[in-house]
């Protein structure tokens, strides 16, 4: 139903959903701190622009009595319950920040007349693509999929001279929320990734994965998985791996690979790590101390959500335009604004663009090195290391099908 918005007469409110079920197990206090830090910045920006207005956030907590799994499994109803709570209290702001779970975002978008913008730190799944009033500030699955297809097709680099058209995908159901939806997108038979590949099989058991590593009859040399190095080690251990196997480890929200003192363990030599370009260095921020890299990205997305709202509010107020209109609700896309950590670019559908980085382990230095970068905004790959010191034969990535190319 239509809810009146606290969003006029020089007073602008942000509704922040503080859900017990979240994409990342982050203390809500840290997210509150991130939001409050963002509010201070927005107030400063509006003041600088000569706009004498008030901007506040209302934190909407769920009671946690029913929906208490802590992860995203029971988030669908929690999101709707919170919306009902907002509706009953007549406390909707100009914008809704949260939820982060794909299930809840999808359902809330479906079940409400959204005349206000929704900003999410998460909602990674394909079911949240192309939503007209939804903005996502952490890389969604679609962006990963487009990189993988682009990389698979690439065959004109010194270190990759074969197009690939096959892959195994390891997905055992214990993944984090981001990984769950990334792998879900790769598994989906109707997705772009599946459409572009000739062969794709999902490995669901540890033993299936382990067997493939030395199976002479395997149908692909490439295995995609999602998680950190420790996750891979638990699965692979020190098992022997055929020399033409390539493991693609998707670990987007982890910048530890770039730290000076990090040495790549031996079990990472057959692995290419896909991560985001480093720089989410919230080291001097009150809300970010003692946060893991993933949680830092999550808190940063909340903060940037506030800055995005401030950016749009400033533009509309300077142009003398109304905030409680469909035009405002649909405006949070196809733009760049100054985020906490640098410029943030949103694509035509309101999804954050970023630079993805593919790393390899140098056999000489045992360090992670940048092989190439990929700009999600233009869907383009940029080679960085033209003569990588790979473990693979001739310092080239093997063909994806055993029996062809370097073995």
């Amino acid at each position: 139903s239509q809810v009146s918005q606290n969003c006029h007469n020089g007073s602008y409110e942000i509704s922040v959903l503080m859900m017990g079920n979240s994409a990342f197990a982050e203390p809500l206090k840290n997210l509150e701190d991130a939001v409050n830090e963002g509010l201070e910045i927005v107030r400063g920006r509006l003041q600088n622009a000569g706009l004498n207005v008030t901007v506040n956030a209302t934190f909407m907590y769920s009671d946690g009595l029913i929906h208490n799994s802590g992860d995203c499994r029971s988030s669908t109803c929690e999101g709707l319950d919170l919306l009902r709570k907002i509706s009953n209290a007549q406390r909707m702001g100009c914008v809704l920040i949260g939820p982060s779970c794909t299930y809840s975002t999808f359902q809330m978008y479906l079940d409400t007349e959204l005349s206000y913008p929704m900003i999410s730190a998460g909602s990674f799944g394909l079911s949240c693509d192309y939503k007209e009033t939804l903005t996502r500030l952490m890389s969604p699955a679609r962006k990963l999929m487009y990189f993988l297809v682009n990389f698979w097709k690439t065959n004109d680099l010194p270190f990759k001279t074969y197009s690939w058209s096959t892959s195994y995908v390891y997905k055992n159901g214990t993944e984090t929320e981001d990984c769950f939806w990334y792998l879900n997108a790769l598994e989906a038979s109707v997705s772009y990734f599946s459409h572009e590949l000739g062969f794709k099989v999902v490995l669901r058991q540890d033993k299936e994965f382990q067997d493939i590593l030395m199976d002479h009859n395997r149908k692909s040399n490439v295995i995609i998985m999602c998680g950190g190095p420790e996750f891979l080690y638990k699965l692979k251990g020190d098992r022997a791996v055929a020399e033409d196997i390539v493991i693609i480890l998707v670990d987007l929200f982890n910048d530890q690979y770039f730290e000076d003192n990090v040495t790549a363990p031996d079990y990472m030599k057959n692995v290419l790590v896909l991560t985001l370009s480093p720089g989410n260095s919230l080291l001097n921020s009150s809300f970010s101390r003692n946060l893991s890299p993933t949680k830092r990205d999550f808190a940063l997305a909340y903060l940037n959500g506030i800055l995005l709202f401030g950016h749009m509010l400033k533009i509309f107020l300077e142009n003398g335009e109304n905030i409680t209109t469909p035009k405002f609700a649909h405006a949070f896309r196809n733009l760049t604004f100054e985020g906490y950590d640098g410029p943030v670019t949103l694509d035509d559908w309101g999804d954050v663009d970023s630079t993805m980085v593919l790393l390899y382990t140098s056999v000489d230095t045992k360090k992670y090195k940048v092989l190439l970068t990929y700009d999600t905004h233009v869907n383009k790959t940029y080679p960085v290391d033209m003569s990588p010191t790979f473990t693979w034969k001739n310092s080239k990535l093997p063909n994806d099908i055993t029996g062809r190319g370097p073995q």
Epitope: G44, L300, D341
Partner: nanobody
Framework: QVQLVESGGGVVQPGGSLRLSCAAS????????MDWYRQAPGKQREMVAT???????TYTDAVQGRFTISRDNAKNTVYLQMNNLKPEDTAVYYC?????????????WGQGTQVTVSS
């Protein structure tokens, strides 16, 4: 009224060091990242370094590894530590702050401080 005041320029020998400061009004300093630019005689103004609100910094290739930008939130001041200076670093250095304008630079400029590297 937005104010940016640079200081710390001077004459230094090649290989020497200087530390530039830029004191800003608190409402600008707390709301935006800040940049250092420089303009050598007869040349276009070029960006040297940027520091974002988080403290993350980026540099132009010419100064990478020699210059360090930092911010002191208590003093509303941004610094540019310049080491291993070269004659080609000779220029007027400007602090740039505030929202980005249509021309992709920030709205407010300081008055500039002269850096001369010469033996």
């Amino acid at each position: 009224q937005v104010q940016l005041v640079e200081s710390g320029g001077g004459v230094v020998q090649p290989g020497g060091s200087l530390r530039l400061s830029c004191a800003a009004s608190s409402n600008i300093f707390r709301a935006y990242g800040m940049d250092w630019y420089r303009q050598a005689p007869g040349k276009q103004r070029e960006m040297v370094a940027t520091i974002w609100l988080s403290g993350r910094s980026t540099y132009t290739d010419a100064v990478q590894g020699r210059f360090t930008i930092s911010r002191d939130n208590a003093k509303n001041t941004v610094y540019l530590q310049m080491n291993n200076l070269k004659p080609e670093d000779t220029a007027v250095y400007y602090c740039n702050a505030g929202p980005t304008t249509a021309s992709s630079v920030r709205q407010y400029w300081g008055q500039g401080t002269q850096v001369t590297v010469s033996s």
